[in-house]
Interface confidence: low
């Protein structure tokens, strides 16, 4: 499995590394996690792509002034947005 | 609770061939590689190969003692993890275990283990 | 290949000892090791993995450590129960296996 990886960048075009998965890793994994409140003051983005053995959460988490969204995909540099 | 029951060990000749089953239960087998490791009698671990999941193509991977000679498949509507062993040798004869990590709790090593089916090569 | 070699092969000791096992790879492997406890007729148990995590419902006295090239496992107060063979696994590049540490009660 190969998954595109970065961390903590503010933009998908720092994000386009593919990186070739361990033999454990059936996951790419994509972690975007925003801080502001509603949709009226944005504190900072940020992105983070991996390969992952597992899908980590399946669904997205709202909390409070922060929200992440974690997506899972399993082909060939699927991770691409 | 998850079990590991491998079947179809036995008595071959050299140069003859054998497959051996798993039937999995208690997880989610789709999602999850499945692997052989061996055991010859008196001695240690051999891992043997795997096979990963179907959005990977169902990827395999062999120690080099059993490339050529072996084959892993799955049929996941059924559960079950296969291994094919051809132009079987008398040092292949030891006890195999099909074995499985446990994803769920951040474990991706062997987690869960069959019971083993012993085959011996012999004339 | 990846090579484990593991030492010793085999040890006695006393009920409360502290018992220490050592496994060295061939090249670096991270913390990319799993310990396996195994005894006899019966399939190994994952005892720790990733060098220095306790597997669920493994008791406490057991731990690990290490990276890289250079880890030890250990029991910190040898019980009856823990005669076994152990052995250590490295899952950086396929799975390699030590040759096994057998642990006897003197």
């Known amino acids: 499995l190969m998954c595109f990886s970065c961390l903590n960048q503010k933009s998908n075009l720092y994000c386009l590394k593919p990186t070739i998965c361990s033999d454990q890793d059936n996951y790419c994994v994509t972690v975007s996690a925003s801080a502001g409140i509603g949709n009226l003051v944005t504190f900072g983005h940020s992105l983070s792509k991996t390969c992952s053995p597992a899908c980590p959460i399946p669904e997205g988490v709202n909390v409070g002034v922060a929200s992440m969204g974690i997506s899972c995909c399993q082909s060939f540099l699927c991770n691409f947005s | 609770e998850v079990q590991l029951v491998e079947s179809g060990g036995g008595l071959v000749q050299p140069g003859g061939s054998l497959k051996l089953s798993c039937a999995a239960s208690g997880f989610t087998f789709s999602t999850v590689a499945m692997h052989w490791v061996r055991q010859a009698s008196g001695k240690g671990l051999e891992w043997v190969g795997r096979?990963?999941?179907?959005?990977?193509?169902?990827?395999?991977y062999y120690a080099d003692s059993v490339k050529g000679r072996f084959t892993i498949s799955r049929d996941d509507s059924k559960s079950t993890v296969y291994l094919q062993m051809n132009s079987l040798k008398t040092e292949d004869t030891a006890v195999y275990y099909c074995?499985?990590?446990?994803?769920?709790?951040?474990?991706?090593?062997?987690?869960?283990w069959g019971q083993g089916t012993l085959v011996t090569v012999s004339s | 290949d990846i090579q484990m070699t593991q030492s010793p092969s085999s040890l006695s000791a006393s009920v409360g000892d502290r018992v220490t096992i050592t496994c060295k790879a061939s090249?670096?492997?991270?913390?990319?090791v799993d310990w396996y406890q195994q005894k006899p007729g019966k399939a190994p148990k994952l005892l720790i993995y990733k060098a220095s995590n306790r597997y669920t419902g493994v008791p406490s006295r057991f731990s690990g450590s290490g990276s890289g090239t250079d880890f030890t496992f250990t029991i910190s107060s040898l019980q009856p129960e823990d005669i076994a063979t152990y052995y250590c696994m490295q899952s950086e590049t396929k799975y390699t296996f030590g040759q096994g540490t057998k642990v006897e009660i003197k």
């Open positions: 074995s499985a990590p446990n994803y769920y709790d951040g474990t991706y090593s062997f987690a869960y």
């Open positions: 096979i990963r999941t179907k959005p990977v193509n169902y990827e395999t």
């Open positions: 090249q670096n492997v991270g913390s990319n």
